[in-house]
């Protein structure tokens, strides 16, 4: 899987869209996780609603929000009030029981506002 690089400005919001085959992943919840090291585990940040039919509802963990358009096949993650510590490698995942399939790898880069001292 290729890694998508996304850049966001510190203090602002960054929106990530992961597309997938809606029929292939029908009924599966989605998750956003942060990769711990190159070969390390992916630590869950947030996942969609426990009831798949309600996956369109926004689910929040801290400053991270996830919602899934299961018909269009797009899961959207919003990282609000982006901080330098949010930079790193993430994954969009499709969940089946205890199994997680990687839909997309995303490298988040945080740019400092040049007007800030």
């Amino acid at each position: 899987l290729n890694t998508t690089v996304l850049q966001g400005m510190a203090g602002q919001s960054l929106r990530v869209s992961c597309t997938y085959d809606a029929l292939k992943h029908w009924g599966r919840r989605k998750a956003w996780c942060r990769q711990l090291g190159e070969e390390g585990p992916c630590q869950r940040v947030v996942s969609t609603h426990g009831v798949w039919l309600l996956a369109f509802l926004k689910k929040r963990n801290g400053s991270t929000v996830i919602a899934d358009d299961t018909l269009a096949g797009t899961v959207t993650i919003t990282l609000k009030n982006l901080q330098a510590g949010d930079a790193g490698l993430y994954q969009c995942q499709s969940l089946r029981g205890r199994e997680a399939e990687v839909l997309q790898k995303v490298l988040v880069e945080v740019l400092e506002d040049p007007l800030d001292d």
Epitope: D21, L23, R29, G50
Partner: antibody, heavy 118, light 113 residues
Amino acid sequence: EVQLVQSGSEVKKPGESLRISCKGSGYSFSSYWLAWVRQMPGKGLEWMGIIYPGDSDTRYSPSFQGQVTISADKSISTAYLQWSSLKASDTAMYYCARGTPLFYFTYWGQGTLVTVSS
Amino acid sequence: DIVMTQTPLSLPVTPGETASISCRSSQSLLDSEDGNTYLDWYLQKPGQSPQLLIYTLSYRASGVPDRFSGSGSGTDFTLKISRVEAEDVGVYYCMQRIESPLTFGGGTKVEIK
């Protein structure tokens, strides 16, 4: 009407190669997962692996990884299970089954009996 | 791999009575996040392919009579067949799909007394 029609019985010798097939009809073949399940004579069911014909994404049970190859040709709505070198222990009934993305199986083929004997 | 253990191996039943088949998993099949229990039941009638009876612990598959019901939690599961009929004979299998590889129980053969 959803149907999975499997190829006929096969009698082979050890070391020979074989490919059996499962043709889907009555639904969008590309859009459903398709699994293979083995049943050795007088025994229970064993999940071998599964394929999504839309993009050929394939998962194998570790017990069957490297022993068989699962493939699909969506242009003719057919999935395949193949061996490059059969063993006597491959003698079994093999079923294909249409699965949901959550991997439960709602439609099954009639089975293909493979006999491997010298 | 998750090991699925079924009991009894064989179950002779009288038509009209209730039959119960047990299935035990070596690990919990409950996903605590979505509340689902990833346990299914299949029936293989003599000389036929398997057919889905129950999925996700207790949901009856299309066309399955309400005489069939699934229950349980965590690692212990039961398939109940009420008012057993002659056409219910065959081998019943439980299957877990919470993780790969998917694994089946050894089967319970239901026969008419």
